[in-house]
């Protein structure tokens, strides 16, 4: 054996954005024949020696960063990439709007604006079907996500979340969906 064992993958199913009280499964996947898996919750000193963690009902205390490794013989693998498990629905939903409007001509510009009544300084915009959000730290309880030179690929359903940088894994409920229509 030369060099460290390759890192496993860690994923959350069905998603790493988990509404409070809903189920989620964390799964660590290494090569066949692993002797021992270790799944850790970072910044909490806790771990379990299993590849799968089933959470029947998401709680605030379970939100955070997770990482896993595996052991073969006396060798440990490199750690997986960190997984950020987010609890949603902790706070009331923000509102999402499009300026100047949700129908935009191809080649035009549009700005999606997420606004909350609370003093949150972080916002995340999700497009249905995309794996990761656009995150935007802003003040004044709102965030703008400009889309310059719109193309047909920008059309779709968008939602936004708001949260605080002090508690980055506790998010609001999602905004009502906004349908962006690209014409022409």
């Amino acid at each position: 054996q030369s060099g460290p064992l390759p890192k496993p993958s860690l994923q959350a199913l069905p998603s790493s954005l988990v509404p409070l009280e809903k189920p989620v499964t964390l799964r660590c996947q290494g090569p066949p024949g692993v002797d021992l898996y270790r799944l850790e919750k970072l910044s909490s000193s806790r771990y379990q020696d299993q590849a799968v963690l089933f959470i029947p009902a998401m709680k605030r205390s379970l939100a955070g960063r997770y990482r896993c490794s595996y052991q073969n013989g006396s060798l440990w693998s490199l750690p997986s990439d960190q997984l950020e498990l987010v609890a949603t629905g902790v706070f009331a939903k923000p509102s999402l709007s499009a300026q100047p409007g949700p129908a935009v001509s191809s080649g035009g510009d549009v700005t999606l604006q997420c606004q909350t009544r609370y003093g949150f300084d972080q916002f995340a915009l999700y497009k249905e079907g995309d794996p990761a959000p656009y995150k935007n730290p802003e003040r004044w309880y709102r965030a703008s996500f400009p889309i310059i030179t719109v193309t047909a690929a920008h059309s779709g359903t968008y939602r936004c979340y708001s949260f605080s940088s002090r508690d980055p894994y506790l998010w609001s409920a999602p905004s009502d969906p906004l349908e962006l229509v690209v014409t022409g």
Epitope: L36, S45, Y47, D49, L53, S69, P79
Partner: antibody, heavy 123, light 112 residues
């Protein structure tokens, strides 16, 4: 109440062997990770080895790997450390310590310690 | 040579405040692992003093507090008392080989 009592220490010649025991009581022993931690005279603490509740997960410090073997007998609520090829630098008080546990999670710290047993390696 | 670095000794007069530092690296404290502190009174086994960077087990006076930032941590003792004279050890975990690591220990002397 939780109690950990080590035994089996003594004087042994370099190259010799010794088996330490730790008797646990006051908790469900098989549910917990436990470790051996040692302290050389006038020195600091050094983690030696850890073993998971079922006995299948074991880990060793580099300084003892291949010479020491940790094991447990949950039916007897006992932890063991078989020490072979002993060296002068293995001279220390050996403590067994329980890792904190809550629900399904184990934690990376020690909430209860035994009083220790002294191992002296000298010719 | 300990993986975590602590000052060998600190001292203070009764009633004073002292702090003990614990410096690690990106593979232990900086890798997202918490820091825990143990107190070892002369001739006795270590006792858990602070867990999870800043939490006190029941029975530990609130004169003892802990904090963590980046790759280091510190233990603060306020209103120093004679019975606080002991060795103090920080402990964390190391990601490389998944081993438990300690600081070299700090001897606290209460003057006078």
């Amino acid at each position: 109440q939780v109690q950990l009592v080590e035994s089996g220490g003594g004087l042994v010649k370099p190259g010799g062997s010794l088996r330490l025991s730790c008797a646990a009581s006051g908790f469900s022993f098989g549910d917990y990770y436990v470790s051996w931690i040692r302290q050389a005279p006038g020195k600091g603490l050094e983690w030696v080895s850890a073993i998971g509740g079922s006995g299948s997960a074991v880990q060793y410090a580099e300084s003892v790997k291949g010479r020491f073997t940790i094991s447990r007998d949950n039916a007897k609520n006992s932890l063991y450390l078989q020490m072979n090829s002993l060296r002068a630098e293995d001279t220390a008080v050996y403590y067994c310590a329980r890792h904190y546990r809550e629900f399904r999670w184990h934690y990376y710290y020690f909430d209860y310690w035994g009083q220790g047993t002294l191992v002296t390696v000298s010719s | 040579q300990s993986v975590l670095t602590q000052p060998p000794s600190v001292s203070g007069a009764p009633g004073q405040r002292v702090t003990i530092s614990c410096t690690g690296s990106s593979s232990n404290i900086g890798a997202g692992y918490d820091v825990h502190w143990y107190q070892q009174l002369p001739g006795t086994a270590p006792k858990l003093l602070i867990y999870g960077n800043s939490n006190r087990p029941s029975g530990v006076p609130d004169r003892f507090s802990g904090s963590k930032s980046g790759t280091s941590a510190s233990l603060a003792i306020t209103g120093l008392q004679a019975e606080d004279e002991a060795d103090y050890y920080c402990q964390s975990h190391d990601l490389g080989a998944h081993v438990w690591v300690f600081g070299g220990g700090t001897k606290l002397t209460v003057l006078g």
